[in-house]
């Protein structure tokens, strides 16, 4: 049970965490004028990773997209790859994560190939997460590296006649949007990795210990409360399942099934 | 079409106090960021104070600050300049405009004339 | 505070003949964020309540006929009247858009010779 929460847990993090990333990269404000300290103008400037916007105060907005490819800054670049690989692992994490729910049945799908995939999509959710996080930290790093640039010279002028209002930029909405959703898709990618070795039967480290009667013979299990005896189909085709446990016999009997990569 | 009535004016002593209102029609006002605009006898045009859309922000000029207020009601399509401890130089025709493209004033009031004298 | 000068703040124009009035902000009126100039053009005739003739230093307002034209970027502005009509006399104001206060120019009076 504690399991099955924990996985259902992890899995809406995960999703609230991939909507919060997809959110981020398509909102305009990564980066919005700094109103702190500067003459109060009667326009706002804010500018995303795929365009720039104007907001007069009439109430009029005006958004430009960046049409050119190569002439955007290399870490403008980097940061859209990173959020873009954030939000595809992220995707297919959750495509793969609700085949992977304890809740969800899909004909006979074994408990192991439900650790498998728990597992996988965990670990997709935590490079998801880790994407988002150095993606909205790289823009971060620009936007501080480039107001103290600006700050330095404020104000520009020609033989200090004519004044030019120097834009200055600091954090945008999109980036405390994208670190909140980089780090609930972290978490959840987590959780996600705690559910699959609840899910997954663990080998002892013992083996199992069989005591030969005269008139049959009993396979103790020591993993589970069930002992099967040596005669008929049983030992064969019964997976005796104790909270995950499962005896070393069993493994070396049937790689072909309860083999885990 | 676009109309902006003023109303309110007249004549008032120092340090009194006097309420304009503009009442809007023919556009979407709340959606508009509005403003009152002065104009001394016989002198050029001088800006007052400006609202902008969803009352998230209010200007003033720094001679008015503090002393004129300006507001707004969506529900009546009306905008308002409350003006308290009036002064002569106060004394100005007073429009009521609509900021539009660019934030420049595209739809103007008649004006309301308020003189302040003793 | 923007201040704007305006020049000449009189100008006596021969119906038909060109008319040039120019501009100067003490402030570049350009925003780097869509590089355009808040800088407006109105013209206020006789008796009447200004009018909107030219937004973003060159863009003509609707109805505003294409003989009136602005130019200029940064602090230098001009508002271009190809041919004087008799009806454009009255006192043309230049303004600050950009940054609050949104300070008006003093206004050059047009007239008729």
């Known amino acids: 049970m504690a399991v099955t929460a924990c996985q259902g847990l992890g899995f809406v993090v995960s999703l609230i965490g991939i909507a919060g990333i997809i959110a981020a990269t398509c909102m305009d404000q990564w980066s919005t004028q700094d109103l702190y300290n500067n003459p109060v103008t009667a326009v706002f400037n804010y500018q995303g990773l795929w365009r720039s916007c104007v907001r007069e105060s009439s109430g009029f907005t005006e958004c430009r997209g960046y049409f050119t490819l190569l002439g955007l800054p290399a870490m403008l670049q980097a940061v859209r790859a990173l959020m873009i690989v954030g939000i595809v692992l992220g995707a297919i994490g959750l495509l793969v994560s609700i085949f992977a729910l304890k809740c969800i049945r899909i004909g006979s799908m074994e408990d192991s190939a439900k650790a498998n995939m728990t597992l996988t999509s965990g670990i997709m959710f935590i490079v998801s997460g880790l994407c988002a996080i150095a993606g909205v930290s790289v823009f971060a790093n620009m936007l501080v590296t480039n107001f103290w640039m600006s700050t330095a010279n404020m104000y520009t002028g020609m033989g200090g006649m004519v004044q030019t209002v120097q834009t200055r930029y600091t954090f945008g909405a999109a980036l405390f949007v994208g670190w909140v959703a980089g780090g609930l898709t972290l978490i959840g990618g987590v959780m996600m990795c705690i559910a699959c070795r609840g899910l997954a039967p663990e080998e002892t480290n013992y083996k199992a210990v069989s005591y030969h009667a005269s008139g049959h013979s009993v396979a103790y299990k020591p993993g589970g409360f069930k002992a099967s005896t040596g005669f008929g189909s049983n030992t064969k085709n019964k997976k005796i399942y104790d909270g995950g446990a499962r005896t070393e016999d069993e493994v070396q009997s049937y790689p072909s099934k309860h083999d885990y990569v | 079409q676009v109309q902006l009535v003023e109303s309110g004016g007249g004549l008032v002593k120092p340090g009194g106090s006097l309420r304009l209102s503009c009442a809007a029609s023919?556009?979407?006002?709340?959606?508009?960021?509005m403003s009152w605009i002065r104009q001394a006898p016989g002198k050029g045009l001088e800006w007052v104070a400006t609202m902008t859309v969803g009352y998230i922000y209010t200007y003033y000029l720094d001679s008015v600050k503090g002393r004129f207020t300006i507001s707004r009601d969506n529900a009546k399509n009306s905008l308002y300049l409350q003006m308290n401890s009036l002064r002569a130089e106060d004394t100005a025709v007073y429009y009521c405009?609509?900021?539009?493209?660019?934030?420049?004033?595209?739809?103007w009031g008649q004006g309301t004339l308020v003189t302040v004298s003793s | 505070d923007i201040v704007m000068t305006q020049s000449p703040l009189s100008l006596p124009v021969t119906p038909g003949e060109p008319a040039s009035i120019s501009c100067r902000s003490s402030?570049?009126?350009?925003?780097?964020?869509?590089?355009?100039?808040?800088l407006t053009w109105y013209l206020q005739k006789p008796g009447q309540s200004p009018q909107l003739l030219i937004y973003w230093a060159s863009t003509r307002e609707s109805g505003v006929p294409d003989r009136f034209s602005g130019s200029g970027s940064g602090t230098d502005f001009t508002l271009k009247i190809s041919r004087v009509e008799a009806e454009d006399v009255g006192v043309y104001y230049c303004q600050n858009n950009y940054i609050y206060p949104l300070t008006f120019g003093q206004g050059t009076k047009l007239e008729i010779k």
């Open positions: 023919g556009f979407a006002f709340s959606s508009s960021a």
């Open positions: 405009a609509r900021q539009g493209y660019g934030n420049a004033m595209d739809y």
């Open positions: 402030q570049s009126l350009l925003n780097s964020g869509n590089q355009k100039n808040y």
